[in-house]
Interface confidence: low
């Protein structure tokens, strides 16, 4: 990941965290952790679509995208989009939806994030080739079974000792501002409004920001281009790594990187990627969760906005523009039309939505066929040419036919999987995003 992407990741996470609705009284500020980033990068290099079984007490979010680059904003959007399926008061995820990526992103006690991305000519567990895999690890891990991601209340009213309030987040006294140095895109302080999820799908091309986190920004990753490891950005937005892993791949922390993979794979925790079916010409990305490993399956894939992406890519959720940073390779972040315009089939994941499990076995591997990469394509509102593949445990999602498909990996956490992954892959670009 570039420095900008790292900062963006952290900033987006923090923006999302600061803007949770209902507001959080104990939300900690996230910061980048190089050790976590190195750990995430090392795993990403293995090119496995599934959660790291050796992640120990680390949360994990995965995101994968075909094309030449990672799309951090898109990944965040995908992860954060699951918010629409999560009920905080009941601590449940809507049936058939994923919420784990989202819950990891807004897990109050998680304060360190590290992400890494790697370009994989072949991603184990995925038929698609040339995929940029984003892995984000978190500490302390989120998605603890039986626990809510955060305590509702006045922002900062329950900050731990030694923390002060800043932008509605509890920040360690004397700590540097993590997002302060974001190059190019300095996300504005979260508005602390409940609108964080409402607009998450509509993402502009600007680099991913946490507040209105772009809907599934997917950066295109050229098949032959090895993408840089995505540093774990201290964003509080869930890292909805698109990955289709076999069961047990889900990690608790949502990955922070999104690549512009033509197709996006959504893990079971990508519940609401394309809540509204959307079709994109040429390709759409639908999260194809392969397995949900120890993660709340409630992650949803944020929609990407087609307007602001240059590179082709696909996104699962409604039309949204991609944010600048996340769309590195997703040059065709084309703005996506309203999610309603995206055609997406939803296939129930094998995991029961809302069901909390310490671990989730992804019994159904994504059966999606390899999605062709479509260079020069970008997520588009109407995917006329894209085909949709129904993947087990995948969430519905659509990307512009020109956009790479995106799949969010399962979000695995020490806790449980919230819900099955629903989704289908719209063929052209693939984006794997999922929580395992």
């Amino acid at each position: 990941l570039t420095d900008e992407e790292k900062r963006l990741m952290v900033e987006l996470h923090n923006l999302y965290r600061a803007q949770v609705s209902p507001t959080a009284s104990d939300m900690l500020h996230m910061r980048w952790d190089e050790e976590l980033a190195a750990f995430a990068k090392a795993y990403a290099r293995q090119c496995v679509w599934g959660h790291n079984k050796e992640r120990g007490r680390r949360g994990e979010n995965l995101f994968a995208i075909t094309d030449e680059g990672m799309d951090v904003p898109l990944a965040m959007e995908e992860w954060h989009h699951e918010r629409e399926h999560y009920n905080l008061s009941a601590a449940t995820c809507s049936p058939g939806q994923m919420c784990g990526h989202y819950t990891q992103v807004v897990w109050a006690k998680t304060e360190r994030i590290g992400c890494g991305s790697h370009f994989c000519e072949k991603l184990q567990g995925v038929e698609e080739t040339n995929i940029e895999l984003l892995v984000c690890n978190y500490e302390p891990p989120g998605n603890v079974k039986g626990k809510r991601p955060y305590q509702e209340g006045t922002p900062c009213s329950q900050c731990p000792s030694g923390y002060h309030c800043k932008n509605s987040l509890c920040e360690p006294i004397g700590s540097p501002e993590d997002a302060q140095d974001l190059p190019y895109l300095v996300t504005e302080a979260p508005s602390f409004r409940a609108t964080e999820a409402s607009d998450s799908r509509k993402m502009g091309t600007p680099s991913s920001l946490a507040t209105g986190i772009p809907a599934f920004l997917v950066t295109e990753v050229s098949g032959s281009l090895a993408t840089k490891a995505l540093p774990a950005v201290e964003t509080q937005a869930p890292t909805s790594l698109a990955t289709k892993d076999p069961p047990s791949m889900a990690t608790e922390a949502p990955p922070c990187v999104t690549t512009e993979v033509p197709s996006i794979l959504a893990a079971h925790s990508l519940p609401s990627l394309d809540e509204e079916p959307v079709t994109f010409p040429k390709s759409t990305h639908v999260p194809i969760p392969k397995s949900a490993d120890k993660v709340t399956d409630k992650t949803k894939v944020p929609s990407r906005s087609p307007e602001n992406s240059l590179d082709p890519k696909m996104s699962l959720t409604g039309a949204r523009e991609l944010l600048p940073h996340a769309q590195e390779e997703a040059e065709a972040e084309a703005e996506l039309p309203p999610s309603s315009e995206v055609l997406a089939s939803v296939f129930p994941a094998q995991d029961k939505p809302g069901e909390l499990q310490a671990t989730l076995d992804h019994t159904g591997h994504t059966s999606s066929k390899s999605l062709p990469n479509f260079p020069n394509t970008s997520a588009t509102a109407n995917a006329t040419g894209g085909r949709a593949l129904a993947l087990q445990s995948s969430l519905p999602g659509a990307e512009g036919p020109d956009k790479p498909s995106v799949v969010s990996g399962l979000n695995s956490g020490p806790g449980h999987v919230w819900g099955p992954l629903l989704g289908l892959l719209l063929l052209p670009p693939l984006v794997l995003a999922g929580i395992f």
Epitope: M203, T219, E220, L225, L310, P324, E328
Partner: antibody, heavy 121, light 117 residues
């Protein structure tokens, strides 16, 4: 410090060709998408083309499609714009700009100083 | 593909607040786009200022003063660049732009020349 320096501009006759270069420094060139944006003196900005960090994806404005080719040599940290079948309306200052990531997203930041291309008989 | 329309000029006194609009053509919703804003002073290349998609999805360019902020006017289907506390050095041309993924092209607005009185 990120620096972008365009070169190769000049006077060319209609129907002629010209190749612009943009030497980049101060950042990992291959990690970023790069673009060309032009501006007719005294007029507005017009996006011309973008290429992803790895060079696998290229995008062009309809006005130049089929005539212009964008490429990059990541080993030389250089961006190129091959302009063929030039027309008078292609006369403009051509800027190269860095994107925020490897994907083309239209996040032009920063920009080079530009190089003037004049197409005239 | 969408068209971004900007007023050709805008004059305001130093210290005033300026609201520049970038109207999206009919058939497109500004909420679906990431509107970026660029500033260009005479003789200089453009400078990236910020982008805006929603209140929760926006960002400033590096070193861009907080006096510059973005927003959307849904009723007008336009992106907004607000410059508060206008200063003489803000006199420049301002361009909005956005990427249109359907056509895979980047679109610039026609630009607004801001004059500080």
């Amino acid at each position: 410090e990120v620096l972008l320096l365009e070169s190769g501009g000049g006077l060319v006759h209609p129907g002629g060709s010209l190749k612009l270069s943009c030497a980049a420094s101060g950042f990992t060139f291959s990690s970023y998408a790069m673009s060309w944006v032009r501006q007719v003196p005294g007029k507005g900005l017009e996006w011309v083309s973008t290429i992803s960090g790895g060079g696998g994806y290229t995008y062009f404005a309809d006005s130049v499609k089929g005539r212009f080719t964008i490429s990059r040599d990541n080993s030389k940290d250089t961006l190129y714009l091959q302009m063929n079948s030039l027309r008078a309306e292609d006369t403009a200052v051509y800027f190269c700009a860095k994107d925020l990531g490897s994907r083309a997203q239209g996040w032009f930041d920063p920009w080079g100083q530009g190089t003037l291309v004049t197409v005239s008989s | 593909q969408p068209v971004l329309t900007q007023p050709s000029s805008h004059s305001a006194s130093s210290g005033a607040s300026v609201r520049l609009t970038c109207m999206l053509s009919s058939g497109f919703s500004v909420g679906d786009f990431w509107i970026r804003w660029y500033q260009q002073k005479p003789g200089n290349p453009p400078r990236y200022l910020l982008y805006y998609h929603s209140d929760s999805n926006k960002g400033q360019g590096s070193g861009v003063p907080s006096r510059f902020s973005g927003s959307n006017d849904a009723s007008a289907n336009a992106g907004i660049l607000r410059i508060s506390g206008l200063q003489p050095e803000d006199e420049a041309d301002y361009y909005c732009g956005t990427w249109h993924s359907n056509s895979k092209t980047f679109i610039f607005g026609s630009g607004t020349k801001v004059t500080v009185l």
